[in-house]
């Protein structure tokens, strides 16, 4: 897989899994995003898959999921320390990955197609400089 | 062979309500999440419901959200779209189609296999 | 009121080439590109391609696709008689949380 496509796909995927509320998004899941500023890509990759893995025990999965799952775990390191207290529900663990990913792609140079929902996520977060 | 077999369509009065099915073969069923989709006469294809492959969760089109039911039995490879309160407008060829699993170079957005259609006909 | 915009018709003599545009918004075709279908009247619709050019097995690379921006094209080189169908493009948008189809593209084969 190519990095840059991988992240791609992992963007569109979590722009459908957000755009669409069920009775899922109010799961309780994992905050992994609380780690220290050091953490690597692959760690975070890794906590986020196992967070995505949990929820398949709780009859939540969708073809957005798995291939989420699937990509994030591409990318990851095979295992990872879990010990996070706080907690999340899905939607938010899912937006708060999008945020993550859109930056990992404009990091490396790619706004084609993607520079419309920039705008729009600054838009939406009061900021308004260029990347 | 993947095939989709559907059934169900039939002449239905306005407020009255129809079970669609959809037999599903040459494929894992419990593996893929399905739709409904429909095309009423002189309009285009328009997409109506999702069920994930465990059965759960679902989604709907708005024009059909609190009306119809999807719904699925793992254990008899079947996919089932219960209508109710139908209207004139519902009138159309209704479709099942399998989703597209998320492969690379296909993220999953499309319908790879779809059903024969049944009519569906609301009409006093 | 189709999300995605057609032609309602296109028309090319056999051996020649035609192309069906679909046009959509930011919140659909701009990030997710779109997939093609084939529909021959009273049959099911069959996947065509993705609008980045993947083709499924058995679809002939007479057929292929491109995107730019809020819009893509369907492509039909060598036309043939069984080319006659209806086509429709279809994408996600995530303003309605939903899959939306195109408003379908007649193509008629001439002479």
């Known amino acids: 897989h190519n990095f840059n496509i991988t992240i791609k796909e992992i963007i569109k995927m979590l722009n459908i899994l957000t755009a669409r509320n069920d009775s899922c998004m109010e799961l309780t899941v994992k905050d992994v995003f609380t780690a220290p500023k050091n953490t690597s890509d692959k760690e975070i990759f890794c906590r986020a898959a196992t967070v995505l893995r949990q929820i398949y025990t709780h009859n939540c999965s969708n073809r957005y999921l798995r291939g989420l799952y699937r990509n994030l775990s591409s990318m990851a390191n095979k295992t990872c320390s879990m010990n996070e207290i706080k907690k999340s529900t899905l939607k938010d663990f899912l937006e708060r990955l999008k945020v993550i990913m859109q930056k990992k792609y404009y990091r490396h140079g790619l706004n084609d197609i993607f520079e419309a929902q920039k705008i729009e996520w600054h838009e939406h977060h009061h900021h308004h400089h260029h990347h | 062979e993947v095939q989709l077999v559907q059934s169900g369509g039939d002449l239905v009065k306005p407020g009255g309500s129809l079970r669609l099915s959809c037999v599903a073969s040459?494929?894992?069923?419990?593996?893929?999440?399905m739709d409904w989709v429909r095309l009423a006469p002189g309009k285009g294809l328009q997409w109506l419901s999702e069920?994930?492959?465990?059965?759960?969760?679902?989604y709907y089109a708005d024009a059909v959200e609190g009306r119809f039911t999807i719904s699925r039995d793992n254990a008899k490879n079947t996919l089932y779209l219960q209508m109710d309160s139908l209207r004139a407008e519902d009138t159309a060829v209704y479709y099942c189609a399998r989703a597209g699993e998320y492969t690379y170079g296909y993220e999953g957005y499309y319908f790879d296999y779809w059903g024969q259609g049944t009519l569906v006909t609301v009409s006093s | 009121q189709s999300m995605l915009t057609q032609p309602a018709s296109v028309s090319g003599s056999l051996g020649q080439r035609v192309a069906i545009s679909c046009s959509g918004s930011t919140n659909n075709i701009g990030i997710f590109g779109a997939t093609w279908y084939q529909h021959l009247p009273g049959k099911a619709p069959k996947f065509l391609l993705y609008s980045d050019g993947n083709r499924p097995s058995g679809v002939p690379d007479r057929f292929s696709g491109s995107d730019s921006g809020n819009s893509v094209t369907l492509m039909i080189t060598a036309l043939q008689a069984e080319d006659e169908a209806d086509y429709y493009c279809q994408s996600f948008d995530t303003t309605l949380g939903a899959y939306v189809f195109g408003s379908g593209t007649q193509l008629t084969i001439l002479g």
């Open positions: 069920i994930s492959s465990s059965g759960s969760p679902t």
């Open positions: 040459g494929f894992a069923f419990n593996g893929y999440d």
